[in-house]
C-alpha cells in the first residue's frame, strides 16, 4: 500500500504524474483516479478511455510508462492522485501522488511602521505585506541576511552605527517561487526611496 509521493508545482504549469519504478509486466489495466472515487482515464486492452471530469481535454496518458500529463494545473487540482494497475495475476497495485499546486508569490510591499533615531542607534520596524499567503520570509540588510529569529513578516530591530545598512530587502518565498521587495534609507535613519 505504502507508495506515496509528494509533488509541489506552480499553478499554470504542465505536470507529469508518474512513478519512479517500472510498471508490472503485461498489466491488464491501468487507471488514474482523482480522489478515491473519480476516474480520470483508464487504459484497457490497448485503448484509453477518458472519463467526464474536470480534467477532460487537458490530460493525456502514456500507457508505456503510466505517466499522466496534466496541462495548466490550478490550485483546485490539489488532491491525492492514485494510479491503479491491475496485474495479469488478477491482483492490483496502487501508487499515490499528493499534488500541491501553489500560486507564485506576489511581489511584497514593505511598509515602514516606525523609524526612530535613538542615541545614534536606529530603531526600525518594517512589515512585509503580501495578500493572505502561506510563505517564508527572509530579511536582508544590504544583501546580508538577518539572524533566523528575525525572519517573519515584521522586522523589528535596533541598529548600531557599525551594522547600519542602507537598503533592506524582504524576500517572500514558497516552494515554487520567490519575490523581493526593497526599501532604502538615508543615513542616519530616514526614508530615501522604495
Amino acid at each position: 500500500q505504502g507508495h506515496l509521493v509528494h509533488m509541489t508545482v506552480v499553478s499554470g504549469s504542465n505536470v507529469t504524474l508518474n512513478i519512479s519504478e517500472s510498471l508490472p509486466e503485461n498489466y491488464k489495466q491501468l487507471t488514474w483516479f482523482y480522489t478515491f472515487d473519480q476516474k480520470i482515464v483508464e487504459w484497457d486492452s490497448r485503448k484509453s478511455k477518458y472519463f467526464e471530469s474536470k480534467f477532460k481535454g487537458r490530460v493525456r496518458l502514456d500507457p508505456q510508462s503510466g505517466a499522466l500529463y496534466i496541462s495548466k494545473v490550478q490550485k483546485e487540482d490539489n488532491s491525492t492522485y492514485i494510479m491503479r494497475v491491475l496485474k495479469k495475476t488478477g491482483n492490483e497495485q496502487e501508487w499515490k501522488i499528493k499534488l500541491q499546486v501553489l500560486d507564485p508569490v506576489p511581489k511584497p510591499v514593505i511598509k515602514i511602521e516606525k523609524i526612530e533615531d535613538m542615541d545614534d542607534n536606529c530603531y526600525l520596524k518594517l512589515s512585509c505585506v503580501i495578500p493572505g499567503e502561506s510563505v517564508n520570509y527572509t530579511w536582508y540588510g544590504d544583501k546580508r541576511p538577518f539572524p533566523k529569529e528575525l525572519q517573519n513578516s515584521v522586522l523589528e530591530t535596533t541598529l548600531m552605527p557599525h551594522n547600519y545598512s542602507r537598503c533592506y530587502t524582504c524576500q517572500v518565498s514558497n516552494s515554487v517561487s520567490s519575490k523581493n521587495g526593497t526599501v532604502c534609507l538615508s543615513p542616519p535613519c530616514t526614508l530615501a526611496r522604495s
Epitope: Q1, G2, K28, Q29, T31, F33, T35, F36, D37, Q38, K39, E42, D44, T80, I82, R84, L86, G90, N91, E92, E94, K96
Partner: antibody, heavy 120, light 107 residues
C-alpha cells in the same frame, strides 16, 4: 488480524438520527477506504457511501445524500455513519466494510453489523 | 447508476450438481465485479473479485467468469455448506451497486 467492531443495536423513533461506529484494528487505518452497506430485513445489500480516512474525502449513494454523514476519527481508528430523519424503511442491519485498496471497493472485511430499528 | 441484474432469484439443486448464477450489468463494467456469499444471520463473505480471481481461502469449486456486461459464478460440485444467498457487485463506477441476490437451496 483485521477487525472491524461496530457499536450495538439501536431503537429509534421516526425523525430521529442514529450514529453507528466502527472501530478498526489490525491494519493502518488511513491506507484503505471505509464503506457502509445496509441490509433491510430479508432484502439485499445496498451501498450507502465510502470515506477515505486519510483525506476525509467522501462518496455517497445519491439516495442518502443529505441524510447520511460519514466521518472518521484517525486518533482512535474509528469510522462513523450518521443517518438523520429516520423513517421505518431505514430499519436494517448497517455494516462497515473495508475496501481492498483506496480505489478498489470490494469488501473482504466486514463489521459484525448493527441493527437499527425505526419504530414509533 | 449501473444496475446489476441477477438470475435466477432462487434455485434448488442437489449435492454434487454444477450450479451457475448469472449477473448482467446495465453498462460495461470491464472486469470490476465481485461475488459474495451470505449465509443466514451472517456477514457477507468475498468469494471472487476482478470477475475471476478467487479470494484467499475460497474453495476451488467456486469460479467466476465474464467481462463487459455478462458475468457468471459457477459452483462445480455443490456441497451442503454452500446453502446461502449469493450477490454480485460492480465496483467499476460509483455508486457501487449489488445484484438483488440469488438464494441457493439444496434439493
Amino acid at each position: 488480524q483485521v477487525q472491524l467492531v461496530q457499536s450495538g443495536a439501536e431503537v429509534k423513533k421516526p425523525g430521529a438520527s442514529v450514529k453507528v461506529s466502527c472501530k478498526a484494528s489490525g491494519y493502518t487505518f488511513t491506507e484503505y477506504t471505509m464503506h457502509w452497506v445496509r441490509q433491510a430485513p430479508g432484502q439485499g445489500l445496498e451501498w450507502m457511501g465510502g470515506i477515505n480516512p486519510d483525506t476525509g474525502d467522501t462518496s455517497y449513494n445519491q439516495k442518502f445524500t443529505g441524510r447520511a454523514t460519514l466521518t472518521v476519527d484517525k486518533s482512535t481508528s474509528t469510522a462513523y455513519m450518521e443517518l438523520s430523519s429516520l423513517r421505518s424503511e431505514d430499519t436494517a442491519v448497517y455494516y462497515c466494510a473495508r475496501a481492498q485498496f483506496w480505489t478498489t471497493p470490494r469488501f473482504a472485511y466486514w463489521g459484525q453489523g448493527t441493527l437499527v430499528t425505526v419504530s414509533s | 447508476d449501473i444496475q446489476m441484474t441477477q438470475s435466477p432469484s432462487s434455485l434448488s439443486a442437489s449435492v454434487g450438481d454444477r450450479v451457475t448464477i448469472t449477473c448482467k450489468a446495465s453498462q460495461d463494467v470491464g472486469t470490476a465485479v465481485a461475488w459474495y456469499q451470505q449465509k443466514p444471520g451472517k456477514v457477507p463473505k468475498l468469494l471472487i473479485y476482478w470477475a475471476s480471481t478467487r479470494h484467499t481461502g475460497v474453495p476451488s469449486r467456486f469460479s467466476g467468469s465474464g467481462s463487459g456486461t455478462d458475468f457468471t459464478l459457477t459452483i462445480s460440485s455443490l456441497q451442503p455448506e454452500d446453502v446461502a444467498t449469493y450477490y454480485c457487485q460492480q465496483y467499476s463506477t460509483y455508486p457501487i451497486t449489488f445484484g438483488q441476490g440469488t438464494k441457493l437451496e439444496i434439493k
